[in-house]
């Protein structure tokens, strides 16, 4: 909360470069989306062109687990990724230009927490600095959304239906259709992060088949129609 912070005004001309890191207090994003964690820094080593390493941690500075690490060779502006947890973290900034900003893909609620950036100069100017005051990532839950619904050919001239939905918490999927009882058990597919897929393996009757996705934030529906062409008698 900003209420406890003390506002400041410039009291003098711009200072010489010292070690510092600038991160926002908070970044908000919705589950399933991507977020950018900004981090810029200043340092006292003018024109440093040696090897460097950029690191992001979660949870705690200094001791928290690394979620991203990349290394740039002397003179190179390319920071070669050495670690990207679950392949979802990517450096957006250019460390040579004092920018360690990170992009996090396919956010889940579990990604909420504090993240800390760190830079290490490993050449002649052997030095390092890490933000003690991390950026807090708040991932908010997402209501269900059906991203794909389709009818596909199945075995023995039958048809099957697939429904893929996303949301956080992951939604529960249910199929309903024209079969007796007006409802069919769906085979719940493997969830992929915030996405869930359910299959209705055998569509036995023509008509409308509806996929319903529901979680604590709401529900979504989508339908497909199956009309098989029956030849003349």
């Amino acid at each position: 909360d900003a209420s406890g912070d003390l506002l400041n005004t410039e009291a003098h001309s711009a200072p010489a470069q010292r070690w510092s890191m600038q991160v926002p207090a908070e970044v908000n994003a919705e589950a399933g989306d991507a977020a950018v964690l900004p981090c810029t820094f200043t340092h006292p080593h003018r024109h440093y062109d040696g090897p460097l390493t950029a690191i992001w941690r979660s949870g705690e500075p200094y001791a928290g687990p690394q979620v991203f690490r990349c290394t740039a060779a002397p003179g190179s502006e390319l920071c070669q990724t050495a670690l990207s947890l679950h392949g979802r973290f990517r450096l957006l900034g250019n460390p040579r230009r004092n920018d360690l900003s990170l992009r996090v893909e396919r956010l889940a609620l579990a990604d909420s927490g504090r993240y800390f950036c760190r830079v290490e100069f490993t050449g002649d100017a052997h030095d390092r600095y890490e933000s003690r005051h991390g950026v807090r990532l708040r991932v908010t839950a997402a209501a269900p959304r059906i991203v794909n619904i389709s009818v596909l050919p199945g075995p023995a001239h039958a048809f099957r239906a697939l429904c893929t939905a996303e949301g956080e918490p992951p939604p529960a999927l249910a199929w309903s259709g024209p079969a007796p009882g007006n409802s069919s058990a769906a085979l719940q597919g493997q969830g992929h992060g915030y996405q869930v897929t359910a299959e209705l393996p055998a569509l036995t009757r023509d008509g409308r088949y509806t996929c319903t996705a529901a979680n604590s934030l709401g529900r979504a529906e989508a339908s497909v129609y199956l009309f098989r062409f029956h030849g003349a008698p």
Epitope: D1, S3, G4, D5, L6, E10, A11, H12, S13, P15, A16, R18, W19, S20, A25, H43, P44, G59, E60, P61, Y62, A63, G64, R114, D127, R128, Y129, E130, R132, H133, R136
Partner: antibody, heavy 118, light 107 residues
Framework: QVQLVESGGGLVQPGGSLRLSCAAS????????MTWVRQAPGKGLEWVSF????????YYADSVKGRFTISRDNSKNTLYLQMNSLRAEDTAVYYC???????????WGQGTLVTVSS | DIELTQPPSVSVAPGQTARISCSGD??????ASWYQQKPGQAPVLVIY???KRPSGIPERFSGSNSGNTATLTISGTQAEDEADYYC?????????FGGGTKLTVLG
């Protein structure tokens, strides 16, 4: 308003223990690193210890390492300093302070006096 | 360990400019902050990041940092500015304070 209030100081014999508390109000306590700073009578300020938001990361001045333990209870908005094996040279006013985002101390308590004497 | 050195005392006439220095190798790489402490009171932050002033601190307080020396400048010093002043810095892990400077406003 933003406020820090220390308590728990007093007279203790050498080798004894004491626990200081610092009650925070007016800001989101769990969003800040906190610190203890002490000042011996007629002397300057001496940084004692830092603790991170959740309490997982702590740092100590060499003069107190192994004897003092900093901790916090975010549910109670309270910072603690457990002081063991106290020595005469630990006699001081102990201040708790909030660390701002530029590694400076932007809010201070009024202090609590700890006297170590036989 | 990082060390910061301050003069024990500085005197200034009312209305004049007071300058208090703080030197140490850490100041080449890390920002300085300054604290004012009056007798029987807790310290108060007056400058941070070498030259930034918290809200509520008068404009006559300013700061600078060049090389390994940070300087607190009080322009148009007033009687109420008489106090002890401490510089502080941080090396990425620990914090350290200078020994303090007693500012006396003459007259």
């Amino acid at each position: 308003q933003v406020q820090l209030v220390e308590s728990g100081g007093g007279l203790v014999q050498p080798g004894g223990s004491l626990r200081l508390s610092c009650a925070a109000s007016g800001f989101t306590f769990s969003n800040y690193w906190m610190t203890w700073v002490r000042q011996a009578p007629g002397k300057g300020l001496e940084w004692v210890s830092f603790i991170s938001y959740s309490g997982s990361t702590t740092y100590y001045a060499d003069s107190v390492k192994g004897r003092f333990t900093i901790s916090r209870d975010n549910s109670k908005n309270t910072l603690y300093l457990q002081m063991n094996s106290l020595r005469a040279e630990d006699t001081a006013v102990y201040y708790c302070a909030r660390e701002g985002t530029s590694s400076m101390f932007d809010v201070w308590g009024q202090g609590t006096l700890v006297t170590v004497s036989s | 360990d990082i060390e910061l050195t301050q003069p024990p005392s500085v005197s200034v006439a009312p209305g004049q400019t007071a300058r208090i220095s703080c030197s140490g190798d850490a100041l080449r790489s890390y920002y300085a902050s300054w604290y004012q402490q009056k007798p029987g009171q807790a310290p108060v932050l007056v400058i941070y990041d070498d030259n930034k002033r918290p809200s509520g601190i008068p404009e006559r307080f300013s700061g600078s940092n060049s090389g390994n020396t940070a300087t607190l400048t009080i322009s148009g010093t007033q009687a109420e500015d008489e106090a002890d002043y401490y510089c502080g810095s941080y090396d990425g892990t620990v914090h350290v304070f200078g020994g303090g400077t007693k500012l006396t406003v003459l007259g």
